[in-house]
Amino acid sequence: GSVPPMVNVTRSEASEGNITVTCRASSFYPRNITLTWRQDGVSLSHDTQQWGDVLPDGNGTYQTWVATRICQGEEQRFTCYMEHSGNHSTHPVPSGNSHHHHHHHH
């Protein structure tokens, strides 16, 4: 069977006027997962995103991440998109005063 991922979007200051947004997927099985950033619903090119490897997390499941740098104040234009085992979900960037957005996809 499959185990759906926990998806968590975080933000961190990158440089003046920019922030790095990171989308992490964890505790999923099997290992094949799509995780990518969109701006205004349009997929970002590969060369503007950074990916972590899909790694075992020690529980028989896997974890990975994708990050991109964006302009501060434009967070609402960006979403992290996930596909896994025939399911999909979309995850927004949290506002500045909230640093975590969790979603366990079922």
């Epitope: 990518t36 997929s43 590969h46 899909v54 998109y81 596909e83 896994h84």
Partner: antibody
Framework: QVQLKESGPGLVAPSQSLSITCTVS????????VNWVRQPPGKGLEWLGM???????DYNSALKSRLSISKDNSKSQIFLKMNSLQTDDTARYYC??????????????WGAGTTVTVSS | DIQMTQTTSSLSASLGDRVTISCSAS??????LNWYQQKPDGTVKLLIY???SLPSGVPSRFSGSGSGTDYSLTISNLEPEDIATYYC?????????FGGGTKVEIK
Amino acid sequence: QVQLKESGPGLVAPSQSLSITCTVSGFALTGSGVNWVRQPPGKGLEWLGMIWGDGNTDYNSALKSRLSISKDNSKSQIFLKMNSLQTDDTARYYCARGAHYGKRWYFDVWGAGTTVTVSS
Amino acid sequence: DIQMTQTTSSLSASLGDRVTISCSASQGINNYLNWYQQKPDGTVKLLIYYTSSLPSGVPSRFSGSGSGTDYSLTISNLEPEDIATYYCQQYSKLPPTFGGGTKVEIK
């Protein structure tokens, strides 16, 4: 077994619109992207666009104004519609499943293609 | 758009030969490169992904290498079923773009 099969009109008159259907089996459209690629006679391959599992679409900007990609998950079908066809749209049109895993993005299974001729 | 160039549009080789097909990008593509094989009947098959990874079912005589702007596909021991046209494809930037193809024929 993953399979994709295109079906189209064969012949389209200039200025008319083109509709092609891609029927898939062996995987769920809710969790896989499907791409459209075409190949004019004697030429190379050109990516037209794709539709993701959630129905979101990405298009080749050179053709975006004339293209529309949609799908029916329950029928396992993806639809390509292109408007205002000209003779240089004559090509073999392929649908292909996209595999997008981190740094890897490739078209792992292709349909056999359907030939479309634009002529009066 | 990123332009992909395959300078050799066709080549002839003998069975058992080592064949190398080159592909260059108009800018660096960070190994975001795939290779496809198109048979004379139009059938298209994924051959190599992410510069050098081999999908299951693809014979080990096929290999890929490269970095930056320059990439290559090698067939180490040409067999009759390898008669086809080979296309490189980048996905570093949208839209994904293909090279013009290299047709491999038997001498």
